[in-house]
């Protein structure tokens, strides 16, 4: 069964910088990745980035750079311009569209106890939705 994992990391040097890492553990060919915040894509979440395997990537503020880390995982760098650091309490969701499996989505957030430079534990987050 495919799984999607999500990790959110705060940069040790810049407390206003965050990186969201997402990956797909499964046998399918990935056709599109969508990253959103505030909830799942299409269910109250706001799109931050879309990554297409061939056509490239597109991101929207406050996302800074979306990139493929491997052929089955991506990372999204975020720049928090506000002093209140809303990212610390935000849920980030990643949806992987895969052939022939369909769509798989999972969400994660920065652990409340996170020190700068630390990340969420590297375990797959339960899948929220499979279309």
């Amino acid at each position: 069964t495919p799984e999607v994992w999500v990790q959110v990391q705060m940069e040790a040097t810049e407390l206003s910088s965050f990186t969201v890492h997402c990956g797909f553990l499964g046998p399918g060919s990935i056709s599109l990745v969508t990253v959103s915040w505030g909830g799942p894509d299409g269910a109250g979440g706001t799109k931050l980035a879309v990554l297409h395997p061939e056509l490239g990537t597109r991101q929207w503020a406050p996302a800074r750079q979306a990139r493929w880390e491997t052929q089955s995982s991506i990372s999204l760098a975020l720049e928090d311009s506000g002093a209140s650091s809303p990212f610390a309490n935000t849920t980030f969701c990643c949806k992987f569209a895969s052939f022939p499996e369909g769509s798989w989505e999972s969400c994660g957030s920065l652990p409340p106890s996170s020190d700068p430079g630390l990340s969420a534990p590297p375990t797959p987050v339960p899948i929220l939705r499979a279309d």
Epitope: G23, E54, G56, W68
Partner: antibody, heavy 123, light 106 residues
Framework: QVQLVQSGAEVKKPGSSVKVSCKAS????????ISWVRQAPGQGLEWMGN????????NYAQKFQGRVTITADESTSTAYMELSSLRSEDTAVYYC????????????????WGQGTLVTVSS | DIQMTQSPSSLSASVGDRVTITCRAS??????LNWYQQKPGKAPKLLIY???SLQSGVPSRFSGSGSGTDFTLTISSLQPEDFATYYC????????FGGGTKVEIK
Amino acid sequence: QVQLVQSGAEVKKPGSSVKVSCKASGGTFSSAAISWVRQAPGQGLEWMGNIIPIVGIANYAQKFQGRVTITADESTSTAYMELSSLRSEDTAVYYCARDTGRGYTRHFWFDPWGQGTLVTVSS
Amino acid sequence: DIQMTQSPSSLSASVGDRVTITCRASQSISSYLNWYQQKPGKAPKLLIYAASSLQSGVPSRFSGSGSGTDFTLTISSLQPEDFATYYCQQSDILYTFGGGTKVEIK
């Protein structure tokens, strides 16, 4: 330019485990995945799995699932591949390689490669 | 799993010959195909990535083509240092290598 240097040759008994290391130097280690590939004597190349050091999550080939563990230590820029329940068929040269890509597309390839570590399984 | 079938498994050729190696995937892999060269006792070396892009430092006599399921590596004029084993690799769903093609001196 990143260079990968692997640990030395090992001789192991059937049923035991082996842990091979791969140290990166001359470039960023955390953000690029490290893959492990093996090659039995006179045979072809076989991908075993990979890891993204910055998140510590590994992906494994189905054939090796449950028998191989890939880990990484960011502080020393070193990746490890541990293979358990060794049998004679596991005698091979084990290579680490960097999963290299453009970032903006999903194209990935292996470059550079480590020099290889010969693991011999014999009673 | 995606299977990669290379042909021929071995071939004999002379210096100056044009050599063609083919690789077939068991399902469509778009252009997620790489080619490597390996010499005895050495680690593989990347030649071509993304089906047709020449890796920096690799001589222009090497070229790659194809998409979907059928791919080709061509050496336009074989040189003495080209006698080696060549592998294709798909990178669409995880990674799989072809069985290899050994290019020997005729």
